[in-house]
Interface confidence: low
């Protein structure tokens, strides 16, 4: 006896759904996809906005930092002397860190040609050098922990830093000297930061004076000069002192530098 099963296949669920349900499902899918795309785009926007806010905050911090240095240099006593010294040493360290020789791969070199040539970093930090010359202009050398970023700033005749690009520069000098009141003249020890622009007379940018110490044989004192100045191409800056023989040339005592802002 042969039994035959007339097995009807079940109707597909999809075809059984009413049209209103299909439209609802379609709209729901479109809504969810739109929601996902919208969320993704909003996340990207938010990320970029936060980056911009962060940049602005950093810029504000940099401005505050520069203002603090300026306050220290103008002698405003809103900060303790210790803070000022700390800030100055941090700033000098920061300048040196910027100029640390990073190993550049060929790829970075080509990038530097494209981007760096338009606005290259210009910075210099030179170290004092004892001189047999009787001139009041201090002598400097590229030695020890010095910085010379590129040929857009050069040390000329060991006495002046010369820039090839116009712009705002932070120029600083630290002069440490050892003097005694009895052995020195009555006049104080004066350090001056001077500018010589092409076709113009020399001019004093900054000046500081210290009275002589009563310590024997002499007392060490330091003068720090620093400020932001507009320099023209070919402008040179140098440091003058009343008595170069009293300047201390030990490691880290006397230095001179600039940084293009």
């Amino acid at each position: 006896m042969i039994e035959t099963y007339n097995q009807t296949s079940p109707r597909s669920a999809a075809t059984g759904l009413p049209i209103s349900m299909k439209i609802f499902m379609y709209l729901l899918t479109v809504f969810l996809i739109t929601q996902m795309i919208g969320s993704a785009l909003f996340a990207v926007y938010l990320h970029r906005r936060l980056d911009k806010i962060e940049d602005e905050r950093n810029l504000h911090e940099d401005f505050v930092f520069m203002k603090t240095i300026q306050r220290c240099n103008t002698g405003e006593r809103s900060l303790s002397l210790l803070n000022c010294e700390e800030i100055k040493s941090q700033f000098e360290g920061f300048v040196k860190d910027i100029m640390l020789n990073k190993e550049e791969t060929k790829k970075e070199n080509s990038f530097e040609m494209q981007k760096g040539d338009q606005n290259p970093q210009i910075a210099a930090h030179v170290i004092s050098e004892a001189s047999s010359k009787t001139t009041s202009v201090l002598q400097w050398a590229e030695k020890g922990y010095y910085t010379m970023s590129n040929n857009l700033v050069t040390l000329e005749n060991g006495k002046q830093l010369t820039v090839k690009r116009q712009g705002l520069y932070y120029i600083y000098a630290q002069v440490t000297f050892c003097s005694n009141r009895e052995a020195s003249s009555q006049a104080p020890f004066i350090a001056s930061l001077c500018l010589k622009s092409p076709g113009r007379f020399e001019r004093i940018l900054l000046r500081a004076a210290n009275t002589h110490s009563s310590a024997k044989p002499c007392g060490q004192q330091s003068i720090h000069l620093g400020g932001v100045f507009e320099l023209q191409p070919g402008a040179s800056v140098f440091v003058n002192v009343t008595d170069p023989s009293q300047v201390s040339h030990g490691t880290g005592f006397t230095s001179f530098g600039l940084l293009k802002l």
Epitope: N101, E142, K143, N150
Partner: nanobody, 118 residues
Amino acid sequence: EVQLLESGGGLVQPGGSLRLSCAASGFTFNKASMGWVRQAPGKGLEWVSTITPHGSSTYYADSVKGRFTISRDNSKNTLYLQMNSLRAEDTAVYYCAKQRWGVEFDYWGQGTLVTVSS
């Protein structure tokens, strides 16, 4: 990759001269201070000379002052050491080195042997 390749070493009689060369690649040569360091047989490393990135300043160890001259050609990425009035005590392996700061060296060559003997 930073590479420093010395050449020009050899045997020379006392009072003679030699010129060492160092071909540099893999970094921005005209931004780096360069130097020469030597190591005599059985002795430690001795700094010989340094030249600043643009060649504006040169520095020498007292033992070689007046006899050795360091120079560089930035267009060829090459460092040189001209050695005159050589003495037996100048016998050493001479290394060309890239300076990070002052007399801190971060990359060295393989070295070239200079023998001063009669």
